[in-house]
């Protein structure tokens, strides 16, 4: 990185050249923070969708066993009763079987699980949508991670791993930005502000420039934010 303060004979610095007025942009780290947030959000969404998909598949694999529980409470339909430790011996007595067949379950308030084609179709449609959402989530995430957009064949695991690495790198970048900002605030990085630059900012702030005072010191003619942004741009 080229320093804005170059050494003279004996190590002193030169006056930086006046720079053209540039639009007042936020520091680069702000963009990275946004990208990090987007990547994190996409990663979270993808992971959540994948989790939901897994749960749905598990639910489908376990057909609702709607038989009365030993304590008389229905065991299906979402009631999570504590699992019984004592397993009852099933009797193969034909007499008992006949009794069971004669029982009318309609009075208990639930019907036998006869899968209707419409219900199956709805569930399949929901499943297709969920899978579509998961894939969309990963596609979005792929666009945010480096090389992801170019590499369409990146697997879901690779995408998540890449997203984690990317977020870590962005975090490191933000940390570095924090350190640089703090060094500016400490007054050990601030290069000279060229006259043109200073005047441009003064005209932007409006004239006359009022003296600004805070716990950290009195700033005249630039506010700390303005100086930090100028310093930050020069630093990069």
């Amino acid at each position: 990185m080229e320093s804005s303060a170059k050494m003279e004979s004996g190590g002193a610095g030169q006056q930086p050249q006046p720079q053209p007025q540039q639009p007042f942009l936020p520091p680069a780290a702000c963009f990275f923070a946004t990208a990090a947030a987007a990547a994190a959000a996409a990663a979270a969404a993808a992971a959540q969708s994948a989790q939901q998909q897994q749960q749905q598949q598990q639910q489908q694999q376990q057909a609702p066993q709607l038989r009365p529980a030993a304590d008389g409470q229905p065991s299906g339909g979402g009631h999570k009763s504590a699992p019984k430790q004592v397993k009852r011996q099933r009797s193969s007595s034909p007499e008992l079987m006949r009794c069971k067949r004669r029982l009318n379950f309609s009075g208990f308030g639930y019907s036998l699980p006869q899968q209707q084609p419409a219900a199956v179709a709805r569930r399949n449609e929901r499943e297709r949508n969920r899978v579509k959402l998961v894939n969309l989530g990963f596609a979005t995430l792929r666009e945010h991670v480096p090389n992801g957009a170019a590499n369409k064949k990146m697997s879901k695991v690779e995408t998540l791993r890449s997203a984690v690495e990317y977020i870590r790198a962005l975090q490191q970048l933000l940390d570095e930005h924090d350190a640089v900002s703090a060094a500016f605030q400490a007054g050990v990085l601030s290069p000279t502000i060229s006259p043109n630059y200073s005047n441009d900012l003064n005209s932007m702030a409006g004239s006359p420039v009022s003296s600004y005072s805070s716990d950290e010191g009195s700033y005249d003619p630039l506010s700390p934010e303005e100086q930090e942004l100028l310093d930050f741009t020069n630093w990069f």
Partner: antibody
Framework: EVQLLQSGPELVKPGASVKMSCKAS????????LHWVKQSHAKSLEWIGY????????SYNQRFKGKATLTVNKSSSTAFMEFRSLTSEDSAVYYC????????????WGQGTLVTVST | DIQMTQSPASLSASVGETVTMTCRAS??????LAWYQQKQGKSPQLLVY???NLADDVPSRFSGSGSGTQFSLKINSLQPEDFGIYYC?????????FGAGTKLELK
């Protein structure tokens, strides 16, 4: 030769004020922020504050706000620090320091000004 | 304010030995740390800035390491001119604060 030349020792009475100077030579004073540091036996090194010699921006350590005032005269490449309402605790060596910790680091310390507050 | 704690307070060593001194910050200061050497009756001289970077004209036997809250300065093969007081200071925002110093004495 790059150097910061500070004014001579001061013997002052309690309650009085003192104004010390720091003249830059061998480099351009306005290129780097100029810091002031107090060194006493009791508290080792203490940062007082800094001034940007180019635009007069100052930043003070909260402990020295109202006690120290930093100014600069660009035309003579000289920085000043005024210390007021002196007490025996202000007896110390005061350094001016031109600091830059960027890619081409620059840390030039003056030789120090000894201030003795005594009746 | 960020407190800087240096240890040990004093250190005795002989010429040719290797010594290490440490500096601890009360909070994360990333790499915003500098090391200075001060000899009796003289102004401090910059040795290391940004935790690990050697200042110009500083011999390569000096090396700085660490980041966050733990830092150290190592001097290999001590030379007679290395004895004095070593200070660390942070520049992570305002106010800058210094450690109390490590006095390196000749054994």
């Amino acid at each position: 030769e790059v150097q910061l030349l500070q004014s001579g020792p001061e013997l002052v009475k309690p309650g009085a004020s003192v104004k010390m100077s720091c003249k830059a030579s061998g480099y351009t004073l306005t290129d780097y922020n100029l810091h002031w540091v107090k060194q006493s036996h009791a508290k080792s090194l203490e940062w007082i504050g800094y001034i940007n010699p180019y635009n007069g921006v100052t930043s003070y350590n909260q402990r020295f706000k109202g006690k120290a005032t930093l100014t600069v005269n660009k035309s003579s490449s000289t920085a000043f620090m005024e210390f007021r309402s002196l007490t025996s605790e202000d007896s110390a060596v005061y350094y001016c320091v031109s600091l830059y910790y960027g890619d081409d680091p620059f840390a030039c310390w003056g030789q120090g000004t000894l201030v003795t507050v005594s009746t | 304010d960020i407190q800087m704690t240096q240890s040990p307070a004093s250190l005795s060593a002989s010429v040719g030995e290797t010594v290490t001194m440490t500096c601890r910050a009360s909070e994360n200061i990333y790499s915003n740390l500098a090391w200075y050497q001060q000899k009796q009756g003289k102004s401090p001289q910059l040795l290391v800035y940004a935790a690990t970077n050697l200042a110009d004209d500083v011999p390569s036997r000096f090396s700085g390491s660490g980041s966050g809250t733990q830092f150290s300065l190592k001097i290999n093969s001590l030379q007679p001119e290395d004895f004095g007081i070593y200070y660390c200071h942070h520049f992570y925002g305002s106010p800058l604060t210094f450690g109390a110093g490590t006095k390196l004495e000749l054994k």
